[in-house]
């Protein structure tokens, strides 16, 4: 895994998929904080499967965006502001 210092902070960057010369599309990219700590005893008691370590992380997402039409007539999101927010993971 890359070193955390190699990952830029969560910020607006040019979207390589939908940008064109003179018409950049921006997207939120980069890293947010994560931390791990011993699971508090009171939390452990509520767990079906007890875990000794609890981890918290946030993900880089758009705080605001505009929907724009690009060449080809389809719409994409042009992000205008970013923040670190709750990560959502769905199991397959």
């Amino acid at each position: 895994a890359p070193d955390v210092q190699d990952c830029p902070e969560c910020t607006l960057q040019e979207n390589p998929f939908f940008s064109q010369p003179g018409a950049p599309i921006l997207q939120c990219m980069g890293c947010c904080f994560s931390r791990a700590y011993p699971t508090p005893l009171r939390s452990k008691k509520t767990m079906l499967v007890q875990k000794n370590v609890t981890s918290e992380s946030t993900c880089c997402v758009a705080k605001s965006y505009n929907r724009v039409t690009v060449m080809g007539g389809f719409k994409v999101e042009n992000h205008t502001a970013c923040h670190c927010s709750t990560c959502y993971y769905h199991k397959s």
Epitope: P16, F17, Q20, M29, M71
Partner: nanobody, 118 residues
Framework: QVQLQESGGELVQPGGSLKLSCAAS????????MGWFRQAPGVDREAVAA????????YYVSSVKGRFTISRDNAKNTVYLQMNSLKPQDTAVYYC???????????WGQGTQVTVSS
């Protein structure tokens, strides 16, 4: 010539899951970014997800982030869209398309219908 063939679309209940596949031929797969797009009746086509040739860069429209996952298997010339926690508003025809590094989304598949309904 470039050919893209989507599969996996079907009728599914809200909250269900589907995995779409898009098999590509007639191109050097690793030279292309791949994308999934969708179009519902009366609505503009929108980009749902995209993935770079190496898989290290992705894009998701906000409405599917955390529910959909795009991936690719370069050995099989195939791109996938794993769709979880499906909602009625995900109902659309889903298309895959390819984009060369120095080009645009000029090659499209025929689409596969996804219907989310109880």
């Amino acid at each position: 010539q470039v050919q893209l063939q989507e599969s996996g679309g079907e009728l599914v209940q809200p909250g269900g899951s589907l995995k779409l596949s898009c098999a590509a031929s007639g191109l050097t797969f690793t030279n292309y970014s791949m994308g999934w797009f969708r179009q519902a009746p009366g609505v503009d086509r929108e980009a749902v997800a995209a993935i770079s040739w190496s898989g290290d860069n992705t894009y998701y429209v906000s409405s599917v982030k955390g529910r959909f996952t795009i991936s690719r298997d370069n050995a099989k010339n195939t791109v996938y869209l794993q769709m979880n926690s499906l909602k009625p508003q995900d109902t659309a025809v889903y298309y895959c398309a390819v984009k060369p590094d120095d080009g645009w989304w000029d090659y499209w598949g025929q689409g596969t219908q996804v219907t989310v309904s109880s």
